[in-house]
Interface confidence: medium
């Protein structure tokens, strides 16, 4: 079975300081899948952020950078200049 596991349940972030979120894929090579990132905010709205390769949701491309780390089998989402509006729960997902 394939599993995507967040590297850390909580990521403390400072305003303006780049932050990196990671999900580890268990049981399969991450390069065989397309990775997606979403953010859930207070109203329980799930907002699309990123999908391989280089597909971003509206308003996310300037401040977010998605990638996969083949060597570590990780999905990576970088927040380049975090602000308070970036608070929320982030979800990684995969598909073929």
């Amino acid at each position: 079975a394939i599993e995507l596991v967040p590297e850390h349940q909580t990521v403390p972030v400072s305003i303006g300081v780049p932050a990196t979120l990671r999900c580890s894929m268990k049981g399969e090579a991450i390069g065989n899948y397309y990775i997606n990132w979403y953010r859930k905010t207070q109203g329980n709205t799930m907002t699309f952020i990123y999908r391989e390769k280089d597909i971003y949701g509206p308003g996310f491309k300037d401040n977010f950078q998605g990638d996969i780390d083949i060597a570590k089998n990780l999905a990576v989402l970088k927040i380049l200049a975090p602000s308070e509006r970036d608070e929320g729960s982030y979800y990684c997902a995969c598909d073929t």
Epitope: E7, T20, D67, D69, I70, A71, K72
Partner: antibody, heavy 120, light 107 residues
Framework: QVTLRESGPTLVKPTQTLTLTCTFS??????????VGWIRQPPGKALEWLAL???????RYNPSLKSRLTITKDTSKNQVVLTMTNMDPVGTATYYC????????????WGQGTMVTVSS | EIVLTQSPATLSLSPGERATLSCRAS??????LAWYQQKPGLAPRLLIY???NRATGIPARFSGSGSGTDFTLTISSLEPVDFAVYYC?????????FGQGTKVDIK
């Protein structure tokens, strides 16, 4: 404060086995994502990555030396041991152990290094 | 394995000058590249990780840029303590590899 210290023989003969120990403090090798690696540097030359061991006992080796290298950890002693068999004179180098960060996955802390000479 | 080629081999500059060091990868390493500084008799020190992020305690005069195969380390104004050898390292794919180094020496 993270510190690492390498120990082992300063002189080994060709064909002998080199055993190096890295003793560290300031972090635990049972923490998710943490690794300890070995890198060597012949006199006046560039750095060469040798091996890495991770918190979950995942081990990685440089393919050019894989058949000669073994890396192990003793979490309770805060030690990582590297053995290299069949040493030859090109193995004369300073050997460093290093902490691979669980947040950047690069070598952010290094030991001072131990110089090993391979000569008969 | 990924080969990292650094240029120039030696850079002769005066304090206060700008230093530009290059690291080229034989195939794409995305942004998974670090820069280290090494002084004689000492262990390397991490300066830059993920191509452009300064490590803890590294002065702002050090900056990194690039992605894919071409990377640059810039020292905006050389201080006497900056004369050293600089190495790039990739962790995009196994085995981790280092460049052959660029020596920055005093003109």
């Amino acid at each position: 404060q993270v510190t690492l210290r390498e120990s082992g023989p300063t002189l080994v003969k060709p064909t002998q086995t080199l055993t190096l120990t890295c003793t560290f403090s300031g972090f635990s090798l049972s923490t998710y994502g943490v690794g300890v690696g070995w890198i060597r540097q012949p006199p006046g030359k560039a750095l060469e990555w040798l091996a890495l061991i991770y918190w979950n006992d995942d081990k990685r080796y440089n393919p050019s030396l894989k058949s000669r290298l073994t890396i192990t950890k003793d979490t309770s002693k805060n030690q990582v041991v590297l053995t290299m068999t069949n040493m030859d004179p090109v193995g004369t180098a300073t050997y460093y152990c290093s902490h691979e960060s669980d947040w950047s996955y690069y070598f952010d802390y290094w030991g001072q290094g131990t110089m090993v000479t391979v000569s008969s | 394995e990924i080969v990292l080629t650094q240029s120039p081999a030696t850079l002769s500059l005066s304090p206060g000058e700008r230093a530009t060091l290059s690291c080229r990868a034989s195939q794409s390493v995305s942004s998974y590249l670090a820069w280290y500084q090494q002084k004689p008799g000492l262990a390397p020190r991490l300066l830059i990780y993920d191509a452009s992020n300064r490590a803890t305690g590294i002065p702002a005069r050090f900056s990194g840029s690039g992605s894919g195969t071409d990377f640059t380390l810039t020292i905006s104004s050389l201080e006497p303590v900056d004369f050293a050898v600089y190495y790039c390292q990739q962790r995009s794919s196994w085995p981790w590899t280092f460049g052959q180094g660029t020596k920055v020496d005093i003109k």
